[in-house]
Interface confidence: low
Amino acid sequence: SGVFQLQLQEFINERGVLASGRPCEPGCRTFFRVCLKHFQAVVSPGPCTFGTVSTPVLGTNSFAVRDDSSGGGRNPLQLPFNFTWPGTFSLIIEAWHAPGDDLRPEALPPDALISKIAIQGSLAVGQNWLLDEQTSTLTRLRYSYRVICSDNYYGDNCSRLCKKRNDHFGHYVCQPDGNLSCLPGWTGEYCQQPICLSGCHEQNGYCSKPAECLCRPGWQGRLCNECIPHNGCRHGTCSTPWQCTCDEGWGGLFCDQDLNYCTHHSPCKNGATCSNSGQRSYTCTCRPGYTGVDCELELSECDSNPCRNGGSCKDQEDGYHCLCPPGYYGLHCEHSTLSCADSPCFNGGSCRERNQGANYACECPPNFTGSNCEKKVDRCTSNPCANGGQCLNRGPSRMCRCRPGFTGTYCELHVSDCARNPCAHGGTCHDLENGLMCTCPAGFSGRRCEVRTSIDACASSPCFNRATCYTDLSTDTFVCNCPYGFVGSRCEFPVGLPPSFPW
């Protein structure tokens, strides 16, 4: 869609005559008829396929035509078309004399024609006017013309419709060729896509208007590059949304359970080693010479009866010293120079020869231990009672006297959820703020240690000195069969040659 514009500039008819040569009386009151049509090699009569327009009387004989575009739009003359401009045309301009006020063709005498011009050619759409002048024997017409597109039409043929907009359907103005030119901050084929804030995360962020960065669920921060941890996550972080990966020393679903009582409270005294054993519980491993829940009590190093085989313990400033009975030697009198002939096994222990009689091993009756069955089993030496419980020897067994708030064989349970012993197969119950947790012994799994999983007690290679390991499947324990020259439950002690004694 566009408009063919014709600007009449000057008409010269000095003698004031008609095309027939007859003069106009009193002068030639001149008006114009314009016919615009498709291109014809020879312009011939016929329909004005692109349109027609007529002017009022513009002057008498010779006159300049005023540019009247601002006041009514009669000059330039407008010939609108609503099709693709073909680029070629034919134009007929006729000058007529109007004896009266009626300018209709049928009201004029046939010889009222003053002059007629016809041109044809190519014409591209554009803002520039083409100036032309046509001269006949008696008249001269100066005019210019051009083709421009109607509002919202663009392109070489005025065939591209483009209407600037700034709404949900697009944010653009139109270029001279009809292509869209996005308004600042918008992009895409129809300029509907906003350009997000610089650095806004491609996947986790988006925007609905320019320079904005809105976060998708689970993400936060100015550029939507920070994940949101699980709601209620206290001492934890995330790498993807809704995670709660606990900081060191914290546990539980929301990382709100203090698993590092040792670090946070340093309860163990006198250089003892602290081990976390569940939420808010711990165990102190005392250095030699100390005892107590927190290793706060000093003891004689001989109190732990370190000397075996009847050796006598002597306290020294820097530790202790074992005075071994005849036939024994070593730091703890652990090595024997005796054989079964010397009846080395105390308390009814049975003697078994080893290494063709060069060595022996004692098999102790219940409640006795040591390489010569010399020690009554003190089941409290391993400090088995947790959470500050006091260990008491009771004949062949032991028992733990628990501090208030704890229960269980080893005082390992907090009184509350763990009171009903929910953990099967000897699982250790930990009382948490929002429930309990079972720590299962080897060979068991599941929330309550209810699932039995077979384990190979020999998998950790517990036997030394190339001893053969056997797994007892009924108890999931191991037995080491020692080669000649080694003794001990793990075959860890070599049997040396008898030293020379002074007695």
Epitope: Y172, N179, L183, P184, G185, T187, C191, L197, K209, A211
Partner: antibody, heavy 119, light 108 residues
């Protein structure tokens, strides 16, 4: 003829601010954007951000986010870029360029403004 | 951020030779958002190619842009003395918009 004319050379002390202007002519300023690019001596081109002369929206490169402000004055068809808390490594030629929104290319460019930061 | 890597860093050729300059993006970008600029000493950059393959107004047809995805190329068919300069590629598919480090085309 479309062109951008920038303000002249500036010498600043560390910690100071600089405001460079860029006057546009030959096109409808408010239907376009202005982008700012800098070039340190002997180095490549570094994009700093853009401003829409249409509605004042801005997009700054993260590196400059805390100390840059871009503005426009549509009555004079002028864009401004202010950089605060200047450091010696801000010494560079600062260019403005018209931003053609539907394809994001920069054409034409201003002649450049040399900013020297030295104590 | 998308990193644009140009190669070679320097190209030494004689007038009349052909030149091929490469630009690689660290991730795929639409060719619509890839431009090439020429910069001569002491001057502002000048737009050569936009949309990966369209010559800007007034740019001679000896300059040709091609490529898609992550690999783009600027080809100069017959070097004229005035073509010796630094060439930069630039992407604006993803904010922040980034330039390559440049290829210096020098006379051998």
């Amino acid at each position: 003829q479309v062109q951008l004319v920038q303000s002249g050379t500036e010498v600043k002390k560390p910690g100071a601010s600089v405001k460079v202007s860029c006057k546009a002519s030959g096109y409808t300023f408010s239907y376009n954007g202005v982008t700012w690019v800098r070039q340190a001596p002997g180095q490549g081109l570094e994009w700093m951000g853009w401003i829409s002369a249409y509605d004042g929206n801005t997009d700054y490169a993260q590196k400059f986010q805390d100390r840059i402000t871009m503005t426009t004055d549509t009555s004079t068809s002028t864009a401004y870029m202010e950089l605060r808390s200047l450091r010696s490594d801000d010494t560079a030629v600062y260019y403005c360029a018209r931003y053609s929104w539907n394809n994001h290319w920069f054409d034409p460019w201003g002649q450049g403004t040399l900013v020297t930061v030295s104590s | 951020d998308i990193v644009m890597t140009q190669s070679p860093g320097t190209l030494s050729l004689s007038p009349g030779d052909g030149a091929t300059l490469s630009c690689r993006a660290s991730q795929s970008v639409s060719g619509s958002y890839l431009a090439w600029y020429q910069q001569k000493p002491g001057q502002a950059p000048r737009l050569l190619i936009y949309g990966a393959s369209n010559r800007a107004t007034g740019i001679p047809d000896r300059f040709t842009g091609s490529g898609s995805g992550t690999d783009f190329t600027l080809t100069i068919s017959r070097l004229e003395p005035e073509d010796f300069a630094v060439y930069f590629c630039q992407q604006s598919a993803f904010s922040p918009w980034t330039f390559g480090q440049g290829t210096k085309l020098e006379i051998k």
